[in-house]
């Protein structure tokens, strides 16, 4: 058993049929010695008396808010949560496996630039009695500071019969140099509590590997005289690291109709303009990627050909 | 503000083209190592990230773009003294810091070159003959060093009398290649920045 936060404790249980469970001793936070009784949750049934209460925790029915009283007055609370371990593996029931970039990916993180700011998000089908708390650091043995905000519900989607909820959190490395060469990864830890179930999820990454620039901005078309060709130009996104001659991007320019199966014109360039062939009912799209370290491409920025 | 983007042209900053070749060569070699050594811990997640130039050179600090010198977090240590002549500086009014930067890059390349050559000598003794260093990568390191053209003491190639542990050597190769790729990215950024300045 360990303390998650004040008056909230996590009991780690091997979860299998007829498992013996864990013996837990609760102590009432009071100078009083006599006349103390214990109850669980909203029940008025007295579980025991005395300053300490010993319980055998085997299942979720044994978890919850234990309260010690004296003469009708509440002295203190202890909330017990369960953390299940099945076949040596901690449970991951609360969050959905996003399976990208690989299986068992519960947390996904992205950074728009090298400033040390990044966003992580996760998915769940649970809508109520759910809380998250996020911590992060650079390295684990001698951790350097990363400050994370509160996790918030950022999107709701309908997937078949199920509703899916996306939560996200923003974090900022306390002293980040955009030009630095990372040797210690960022560690992100998410504590998830659903009712009386506790789970924790972690992710480890270098900022350089989670870079995904914003789409290029200000796309403009200029038809070329006596030609089917069009000059398309754009600018670096505002959120990208500066100076741009140091943090350079490369671009992919594509002309395509509405369907992905349609024919297309595609060209890659390091410049902020390109010449392509425009077709009726097609769109010109441009996306960006770090020129020197191939992490993710940005989303497309698009303008219609006409 | 979009600073001009360079294309490798002989008339331009002479080291840019070489640095682009360097990044390409080390990336290819790293990819080859990952594929060939698939049953060794050779991915970014599996290896320890070591920097053989740590406390010996200060390329990131010495080559910091002017725009980032206002960032406190970027200014850990900037007291280094290197030789200040080099052909990449040709026909330009260059600051002391730029000379310091390029000589730091030169020292990096020299250290990696020695490490890679020593390692290759060991790998050539491996009866499995599983992986060797790409001669193109070694040639590209050499070309960039020549373009930088700094005079510096020769670092003797390390020779080891004990029987090489090929497993450890291959893991060390992965560690070196990952670190060198990151440094090659920095070098490429620096050359692009200097070319645009």
């Amino acid at each position: 058993i360990w303390e998650l936060k004040k008056d909230v404790y996590v009991v780690e249980l091997d979860w299998y049929p007829d498992a013996p469970g864990e013996m837990v001793v609760l102590t009432c936070d009071t100078p009083e010695e006599d006349g103390i009784t214990w109850t669980l949750d909203q029940s008025s049934e007295v579980l025991g008396s005395g300053k300490t209460l010993t319980i055998q925790v085997k299942e979720f029915g044994d978890a919850g808010q234990y309260t010690c009283h004296k003469g009708g007055e509440v002295l203190s609370h202890s909330l017990l949560l369960l953390h299940k371990k099945e076949d040596g593996i901690w449970s991951t029931d609360i969050l959905k496996d996003q399976k990208e970039p690989k299986n068992k990916t519960f947390l996904r993180c992205e950074a728009k630039n090298y400033s040390g700011r990044f966003t992580c998000w996760w998915l769940t089908t649970i809508s109520t009695d759910l809380t998250f708390s996020v911590k992060s650091s650079r390295g684990s043995s001698d951790p350097q500071g990363v400050t994370c905000g509160a996790a918030t519900l950022s999107a709701e989607r309908v997937r078949g019969d199920n509703k899916e909820y996306e939560y996200s959190v923003e974090c900022q490395e306390d002293s980040a140099c955009p030009a630095a060469e990372e040797s210690l990864p960022i560690e992100v830890m998410v504590d998830a509590v659903h009712k009386l179930k506790y789970e924790n999820y972690t992710s480890s990454f270098f900022i350089r590997d989670i870079i995904k620039p914003d789409p290029p901005k200000n796309l403009q078309l200029k038809p070329l005289k006596n030609s089917r060709q069009v000059e398309v130009s754009w600018e670096y996104p505002d959120t990208w690291s500066t100076p741009h001659s140091y943090f350079s991007l490369t671009f992919c320019v594509q002309v395509q109709g509405k369907s992905k199966r349609e024919k297309k014109d595609r060209v890659f360039t390091d410049k902020t303009s390109a010449t392509v062939i425009c077709r009726k009912n097609a769109s010109i799209s441009v996306r960006a990627q770090d020129r020197y370290y191939s992490s993710s491409w940005s989303e497309w920025a698009s303008v219609p050909c006409s | 503000r979009n600073l001009p983007v360079a294309t490798p042209d002989p008339g331009m900053f002479p080291c840019l083209h070489h640095s682009q070749n360097l990044l390409r060569a080390v990336s290819n070699m790293l990819q080859k190592a990952r594929q060939t050594l698939e049953f060794y811990p050779c991915t970014s997640e599996e290896i320890d990230h070591e920097d053989i130039t740590k406390d010996k050179t200060s390329t990131v600090e010495a080559c910091l773009p002017l725009e980032l010198t206002k960032n406190e977090s970027c200014l850990n240590s900037r007291e280094t003294s290197f030789i200040t002549n080099g052909s990449c500086l040709a026909s330009r009014k260059t600051s002391f810091m730029m000379a310091l930067c390029l000589s730091s890059i030169y020292e990096d390349l020299k250290m990696y070159q020695v490490e890679f050559k020593t390692m290759n000598a060991k790998l050539l003794m491996d009866p499995k003959r599983q992986i060797f260093l790409d001669q193109n990568m070694l040639a590209v390191i050499d070309e960039l060093m020549q373009a930088l053209n700094f005079n510096s003491e020769t670092v003797p190639q390390k020779s080891s009398l004990e029987e090489p542990d090929f497993y450890k050597t291959k893991i060390k190769l992965c560690i070196l290649l990952h670190a060198f790729r990151i440094r090659a990215v920095t070098i490429d950024r620096v050359m692009s920045y200097l070319n645009a300045s």
Partner: antibody
Framework: QVQLVQSGAEVKKPGSSVKVSCKAS????????LHWVRQAPGQGLEWMGW????????EYAPKFQGRVTITADESTSTAYMELSSLRSEDTAVYMC???????????WGQGTLVTVSS | DIVMTQSPLSLPVTPGEPASISCRAS??????LHWYQQKPGQAPRQLIA???QSISGVPSRFSGSGSGTDFTLTISSLQPEDFATYYC?????????FGQGTKVEIK
């Protein structure tokens, strides 16, 4: 399976014209760009131009501009390349090639040898 | 027009050995570079798209690298069926242009 089948070999006199055909099978004809590339005996490849069969848009290499005409007939899934004012240096194998991507080629025809000789 | 220069023009290789063909562009073409194989009397066959993207059905011994002006096609271990002429082609701008070709011959 996608296939491009070209018309047979031709012998032409200098100053005349030649029209080579390329019939596509497999896949929808208008879903692909169609190019013509030539190869003189023992020489390399030389791009001549492309057509978008969907709308008849064409683009020609400056070297052939004014001398080459590329057309397409959607009803027969056939593209044509006509080269006029032939000279001896136009003796080559003429190949059609196609792709959903405009600027490179994934399927090629077998080639048509055009010999220009007086 | 962008001029593509291949080297060497002829490459004698022992079967089972690796081979590398170089292609250089007269100006920067990013990764807009494609490789083809042509055997005598046959049409070209696509090997690599956009400098390094492998094509389905092409053996994994063929790989491409490069960007900007310098590109390489590598055959990790030459098989008897690989003896042919190889062409690079730029797609950065029209007109599309090819290298002169490199003939890989049995040593």
């Amino acid at each position: 399976q996608v296939q491009l089948v070209q018309s047979g070999a031709e012998v032409k006199k200098p100053g005349s014209s030649v029209k080579v055909s390329c019939k596509a099978s497999g896949g929808t004809f208008s879903d692909y760009y169609l190019h013509w590339v030539r190869q003189a005996p023992g020489q390399g490849l030389e791009w001549m131009g492309w057509i978008d069969p969907e709308n008849g848009d064409t683009e020609y290499a400056p070297k052939f501009q004014g001398r080459v005409t590329i057309t397409a007939d959607e009803s027969t899934s056939t593209a044509y390349m006509e080269l006029s004012s032939l000279r001896s240096e136009d003796t080559a194998v003429y190949m059609c090639a196609r792709n959903k991507e405009l600027r490179y080629f994934d399927v090629w025809g077998q080639g048509t040898l055009v010999t220009v000789s007086s | 027009d962008i001029v593509m220069t291949q080297s060497p023009l002829s490459l004698p290789v022992t079967p089972g050995e690796p081979a590398s063909i170089s292609c250089r562009a007269s100006q920067s073409i990013s990764i807009n570079l494609h490789w083809y194989q042509q055997k005598p009397g046959q049409a070209p066959r696509q090997l690599i798209a956009f400098a390094s993207q492998s094509i389905s059905g092409v053996p994994s011994r063929f790989s491409g690298s490069g960007s900007g002006t310098d590109f390489t096609l590598t055959i990790s271990s030459l098989q008897p069926e690989d003896f042919a002429t190889y062409y690079c082609q730029q797609s950065n701008s029209f007109p599309l242009t090819f290298g002169q070709g490199t003939k890989v011959e049995i040593k």
